[in-house]
């Protein structure tokens, strides 16, 4: 058993049928010595008396808010949560496996640049009685500071019969140098509590591996005289690290017909312009990627050919 | 990326072209190592990230873009000094810091070159003959060093009398390639920045 926060405790259980569970001793936080009784949750049934209460925690029915009283007055509370270990592996009931970029990916994180700021998100089908708390650091043995905000519900989607909820959090490394070469990964730890179930999820990454630039901005077309060709130009996104000559991007320019089946013409360039043939009803799209470290491509920025 | 790329003209700065070749070569070598050594811990998540140049060179600090010198987090240690007669210096007006930067890059390349050559000698003794260093990568390191053209004492190749542990050598190769790829990215950024200046 360990303390998650004041008056909230996590009991780790080896979870299998007929498991003996864990013996837990609760102590009433009071100078009083006698006349103390204990109850669980809203029930008025007295579970025991005395300054300490010994319980065998086996299932969720044994978890909850234990309260010690004296003469009708509440003295203190202890909330017991359960953390299930199933055959040596901590349960992952609360969050959905996003399966991207690989199986068992519960937390996904992205950064728009090298400033040390990043966003993580996760999915669940649970809509109520759910709380998250997020901590992060650079490295784990001698951790350096990363400050995370509160996790917020950022999207709701309908997936088949189920509603899916996306939560996200923004974090910022306290003293980040955009040019630094990372040798210790960022660690992100999310504590999830659903009713009386506790779970924790972790992700470990280098900022350089989660970079996904914003799409190029100010995408414009300039027709070339007496030609079906157009000059496409664009700019680096505002959120990208500066100077751009150091943090350079490479670009992919795509001409896509109205039909998804039509052949796509693609050109790759390090410049912020390109000359392409603009077909009728087609659209031109441009996306960006770090020129030197191949992390994710940005989303496409698009303009119609007409 | 294995796709047609319209590359910019390296122009007046001969090292840019060499640094681009270097990054390509080390990235290819790392990919080859990951595939060949699939049963070894060779992915970024599995290896210890060690920098053999740590406390010996200070490339990131010495080559910091002017715009980032206002960022206190970037100014940890900028006290190392180096030889200053590089041939990549495109104009007479090149600052002392730029000379320091290029000389730091040269020292990095020299250290990695020695490590890679020593390692290759060990890998050639492996009866499994599982993996060797790409000669193209070693050649590209050499070319960039020549383009930088710094006078520096030659570091003797490390020789080892004891029987090599091939498992450890292959893991060390992965560690080295990951670190060198990260340094090659920094070198490429620096060359691009200097070329634009």
């Amino acid at each position: 058993i360990w303390e998650l926060k004041k008056d909230v405790y996590v009991v780790e259980l080896d979870w299998y049928p007929d498991a003996p569970g864990e013996m837990v001793v609760l102590t009433c936080d009071t100078p009083e010595e006698d006349g103390i009784t204990w109850t669980l949750d809203q029930s008025s049934e007295v579970l025991g008396s005395g300054k300490t209460l010994t319980i065998q925690v086996k299932e969720f029915g044994d978890a909850g808010q234990y309260t010690c009283h004296k003469g009708g007055e509440v003295l203190s509370h202890s909330l017991l949560l359960l953390h299930k270990k199933e055959d040596g592996i901590w349960s992952t009931d609360i969050l959905k496996d996003q399966k991207e970029p690989k199986n068992k990916t519960f937390l996904r994180c992205e950064a728009k640049n090298y400033s040390g700021r990043f966003t993580c998100w996760w999915l669940t089908t649970i809509s109520t009685d759910l709380t998250f708390s997020v901590k992060s650091s650079r490295g784990s043995s001698d951790p350096q500071g990363v400050t995370c905000g509160a996790a917020t519900l950022s999207a709701e989607r309908v997936r088949g019969d189920n509603k899916e909820y996306e939560y996200s959090v923004e974090c910022q490394e306290d003293s980040a140098c955009p040019a630094a070469e990372e040798s210790l990964p960022i660690e992100v730890m999310v504590d999830a509590v659903h009713k009386l179930k506790y779970e924790n999820y972790t992700s470990s990454f280098f900022i350089r591996d989660i970079i996904k630039p914003d799409p190029p901005k100010n995408l414009q077309l300039k027709p070339l005289k007496n030609s079906r060709q157009v000059e496409v130009s664009w700019e680096y996104p505002d959120t990208w690290s500066t100077p751009h000559s150091y943090f350079s991007l490479t670009f992919c320019v795509q001409v896509q017909g109205k039909s998804k089946r039509e052949k796509k013409d693609r050109v790759f360039t390090d410049k912020t312009s390109a000359t392409v043939i603009c077909r009728k009803n087609a659209s031109i799209s441009v996306r960006a990627q770090d020129r030197y470290y191949s992390s994710s491509w940005s989303e496409w920025a698009s303009v119609p050919c007409s | 990326r294995n796709l047609p790329v319209a590359t910019p003209d390296p122009g007046m700065f001969p090292c840019l072209h060499h640094s681009q070749n270097l990054l390509r070569a080390v990235s290819n070598m790392l990919q080859k190592a990951r595939q060949t050594l699939e049963f070894y811990p060779c992915t970024s998540e599995e290896i210890d990230h060690e920098d053999i140049t740590k406390d010996k060179t200070s490339t990131v600090e010495a080559c910091l873009p002017l715009e980032l010198t206002k960022n206190e987090s970037c100014l940890n240690s900028r006290e190392t000094s180096f030889i200053t007669n590089g041939s990549c210096l495109a104009s007479r007006k090149t600052s002392f810091m730029m000379a320091l930067c290029l000389s730091s890059i040269y020292e990095d390349l020299k250290m990695y070159q020695v490590e890679f050559k020593t390692m290759n000698a060990k890998l050639l003794m492996d009866p499994k003959r599982q993996i060797f260093l790409d000669q193209n990568m070693l050649a590209v390191i050499d070319e960039l060093m020549q383009a930088l053209n710094f006078n520096s004492e030659t570091v003797p190749q490390k020789s080892s009398l004891e029987e090599p542990d091939f498992y450890k050598t292959k893991i060390k190769l992965c560690i080295l390639l990951h670190a060198f790829r990260i340094r090659a990215v920094t070198i490429d950024r620096v060359m691009s920045y200097l070329n634009a200046s």
């Epitope: 080896d14 979870w15 299998y16 049928p17 007929d18 498991a19 299932e59 969720f60 270990k85 199933e86 055959d87 040596g88 592996i89 009931d93 690989k102 199986n103 068992k104 089908t125 | 049963f39 811990p41 599995e46």
Partner: antibody, heavy 115, light 112 residues
Framework: QVQLVESGGGVVQPGRSLRLSCAAS????????MHWVRQAPGKGLEWVAF????????YYADSVKGRFTISRDNSKNTLYLQMNSLRAEDTAVYYC????????WGQGTMVTVSS | QSVLTQPPSVSGAPGQRVTISCSGS????????VKWYQQLPGTAPKLLIY???QRPSGVPDRFSGSKSGTSASLAITGLQAEDEADYYC????????????FGTGTKVTVLA
């Protein structure tokens, strides 16, 4: 006392269907994940499928994906395996088992796929 | 096809010590715990070892398990006639959990 009893096995022709049941007793069935494991005659153990305690997630071996469906009725304390498009290579003893460090197995039910 | 490899058979005289190996990789045994089962002819598997080296109550201390890196092993000391059975190791893969990975199985023969 934890007990698992499989039923529903038998002889079936290739391409036909069969539904296996596993009746659980002696524990809170709705709190635990459950597996189906099979063993072809004279062969080793092969995992078939898994279902979470609440039925929210199901996992299948590649060899049965798209043909077999695992399900559970927590109100009836019963686990099911719906087997469609059966093949000769599905011939085996099918066991249900609890998920956990200390697991409990049923006695098994024989499925024979033969023309 | 099983990714956990066991020797097809091992044998020993009564009273001897035999060991069964179970070889995996970094993503399965290297990252997860190992179980061992004994299966007597015509019966369901019986749990012998969980969490690499733990014995459930009722299993004789002649059976012991260990794990090192990407391999695990089961040792039977003081071999007895009733130990003649098939033995299976089981683990998980970190990317396909909760799918059970079983070893290929080892037939233990007690020599007369």
């Amino acid at each position: 006392q934890v007990q698992l009893v499989e039923s529903g096995g038998g002889v079936v022709q290739p391409g036909r269907s069969l539904r296996l049941s596993c009746a659980a007793s002696g524990f809170t069935f709705s709190s635990y994940g459950m597996h189906w494991v099979r063993q072809a005659p004279g062969k080793g153990l092969e995992w078939v499928a898994f279902i979470r305690y609440d039925g929210s997630n199901k996992y299948y071996a590649d060899s049965v994906k798209g043909r077999f469906t695992i399900s559970r009725d927590n109100s009836k304390n019963t686990l099911y395996l719906q087997m469609n498009s059966l093949r000769a290579e599905d011939t085996a003893v099918y066991y249900c088992k609890t998920h956990g460090s200390h697991d409990n197995w049923g006695q098994g039910t024989m499925v024979t796929v033969s023309s | 096809q099983s990714v956990l490899t066991q020797p097809p058979s091992v044998s020993g005289a009564p009273g001897q010590r035999v060991t069964i190996s179970c070889s995996g990789s970094r993503s399965n045994i290297g990252s997860n715990t190992v179980k061992w089962y004994q299966q007597l002819p015509g019966t369901a598997p019986k749990l012998l070892i969980y969490y690499n080296d733990q014995r459930p109550s009722g299993v004789p201390d002649r059976f012991s398990g260990s794990k090192s890196g990407t391999s695990a092993s089961l040792a039977i000391t003081g071999l007895q006639a009733e130990d003649e059975a098939d033995y299976y190791c089981q683990s998980y893969d970190r990317y396909t959990h909760p799918a059970l990975l079983f070893g290929t199985g080892t037939k233990v023969t007690v020599l007369a």
